[in-house]
């Protein structure tokens, strides 16, 4: 026969020969890292026909990474649902705390014993620092040096000075949340004023007011024989200005070979468009547009 | 065929030391991991510590730690127990056993034993 | 270091089954090794796992395991079968640290 087979797990004892007669037997042990266990045989012999008798090694099993706990708060769950060398231990902490170490350890061979690539981790609770102060407003539990997971401020913002009021931008609630940081930025509390929106050949059809604040919505639809160019829906946003822009009403073009667009605001068209300012919201001929802006 | 032969057992006094030996024979002493084990009189078996086949890992339980120390000497096929501040409960009798594998394995053949006797 | 608990006592009529269990939090992870010990003599290895005996140890002897506990099961026990039987695995302190069980004094019948 020649050399006898080669194993994963086991090893030749003593050296190799690159013959052996017939009926020569040759004995395996496991390999460091492996350990034997009964019943199967760890020899061959060279049978008539010089092939080796069969001869596997099974019977030799890996050795085994210490015992892991499940972390306080989290767990330890074996990806392949064994201890042995090779195996991958991955960690998770429960809703409310957050890993401090590495999420996944391996079991790893050094010499003849298994041991884990490294210490266990810790699942500590999130805790949140508390949330910024702001200009011109103030959060619920502002006395609370430490916040838990999911504890939740509101904003809101202070009675203003002048006749217009502070808007809130941005969310007036947040949370402590997973990386122990709180969920959004802190809001912003300031005055927010647009210009009033003109549109020539058109018209308001909803958001009526002498005033626009953070927020406020107005719709327009264009008189008849005019297109809208630009959105039939605009708010007023937080840099003080109407987002999208204010549109127009472009006159429709009577040329036979162009079609004219259609106007993004439905509806029937009034036949008589009585004068601007006797339309709700558009400013007294003494008021004067450009005044209402900044009062 | 494996064989494993203790000696160095007796009566002793509490607080002195002893020496174990364990003598191998029927297998290649130097692959593989040994371990000694005791029981107390009218008691359970108890793991006490473990050796691998170089001699450069070592295992004690907590009842003997600092106390029991274990060595070989692969030259000898011989594998050692050195017992120090030794106590009335360290009375038993110990068994070396030969692991499965370099490393801890199991404990797939045992001698037949020594009586320690702790007593003043 | 963790335990591995096992029945002090346990009986079985001859020629019938009985199982010597053995539980513990590292049998949840870990194989046991099982051994017999008569009387004045040193323990003998008999099982490890569910069912891997050394050649000599009778095939009325079979293992098991679910969960935290571990099972030595003697099929139509025999008078020699009377013996002290102990579990071993691995501690689940987190070392590498052995343990075996109380003992199982088994009698038969």
């Known amino acids: 026969c020649e050399a006898p087979p080669t194993f994963e797990a086991m090893e030749l004892i003593g050296k190799p020969k690159p013959y052996y007669r017939v009926g020569e037997r040759v004995d395996y042990k496991c390999k460091k890292g492996y350990f034997y266990i009964p019943p199967l045989a760890t020899h061959t012999i060279c049978d008539r026909n010089h092939t080796w008798l069969p001869v596997s090694d099974e019977g030799c099993y890996r050795e085994m990474c210490p015992h892991i706990r499940d972390p306080l708060n989290g767990e330890a769950i074996l990806a392949n649902g064994s201890y042995e060398f090779g195996a991958e231990l991955h960690f998770i902490c429960n809703e409310g705390y957050y890993l401090i170490g590495k999420d996944i350890l391996y079991c790893e061979l050094k010499d003849t014993v298994a041991i884990w690539s490294g210490k266990p981790p810790l699942c500590e609770k999130i805790l949140c620092t508390p949330p910024p102060k702001i200009k011109n407003g103030k959060h619920t539990f502002s006395e609370v040096e430490v916040f838990e997971y999911l504890d939740a401020v509101t904003y809101s913002c202070d009675p203003a000075p002048g006749p217009d009021p502070f808007s809130l931008i941005g969310e007036s609630m947040i949370y402590c949340g997973n990386n122990s940081t709180w969920s959004h930025a802190a809001p912003e509390c300031k005055v927010v004023k647009c210009r009033f929106p003109v549109v020539e050949n058109g018209k308001q059809i909803s958001g009526f007011g002498k005033k626009f604040y953070y927020k406020a919505t107005v719709m327009f639809e264009c008189d008849k024989g005019y297109y809208l160019n630009g959105s039939d829906k605009i708010v007023c946003e937080s840099n003080s200005t109407w987002d999208p822009p204010v549109p127009k009403c472009l006159k429709v073009s009577t040329s036979p070979t162009t079609k004219s667009p259609t106007s993004s605001a439905s509806g029937p068209r009034p036949t008589y468009k009585p004068p601007v300012s006797n339309y709700p919201g558009y400013p007294k001929p003494d008021e004067g547009i450009l005044n209402n802006l900044d009062d | 065929q494996v064989q494993l032969v203790e000696s160095g057992g007796g009566v002793v006094q509490p607080g002195r030391s002893l020496r174990l030996s364990c003598a191998a024979s029927?297998?290649?002493?130097?692959?593989?991991?040994m371990h000694w084990v005791r029981q107390a009189p009218g008691k359970g078996l108890e793991w006490l510590s473990f050796?691998?086949?170089?001699?450069?890992?070592?295992y004690y339980a907590d009842s003997v730690k600092g106390r029991f120390t274990i060595s070989r000497d692969n030259s000898k096929n011989t594998l050692y127990l050195q017992m120090n501040s030794l106590r009335a409960e360290d009375t038993a009798v110990y068994w070396c056993?030969?692991?499965?594998?370099?490393?801890?394995?199991?404990?797939?053949?045992w001698g037949q034993g020594t009586l320690v006797t702790v007593s003043s | 270091s963790s335990e591995l608990t096992q029945d002090p006592a346990v009986s079985v009529a001859l020629g019938q089954t009985v199982r010597i269990t053995c539980q513990g939090d590292?049998?949840?992870?870990?194989?046991v090794s099982w051994f017999q010990q008569k009387p004045g003599q040193a323990p003998v290895f008999v099982m490890y796992g569910q069912n891997n005996r050394p050649s000599g140890i009778s095939e009325r002897f079979s293992g098991s395991s679910s969960g935290n506990t571990a099972s030595l099961i003697i099929t139509g026990a025999q008078a020699e079968d009377e013996a002290d039987y102990y579990c071993?695995?691995?501690?689940?302190?987190?070392?590498?640290?052995?343990?075996f069980g109380g003992g199982t004094k088994l009698t038969v019948l």
């Open positions: 050796i691998s086949y170089d001699g450069d890992e070592k």
């Open positions: 056993a030969k692991a499965s594998g370099y490393g801890m394995g199991i404990l797939d053949y």
């Open positions: 029927g297998f290649t002493f130097s692959t593989y991991g």
């Open positions: 071993h695995s691995r501690d689940s302190s987190g070392t590498h640290l052995r343990v």
């Open positions: 590292s049998l949840r992870s870990y194989y």
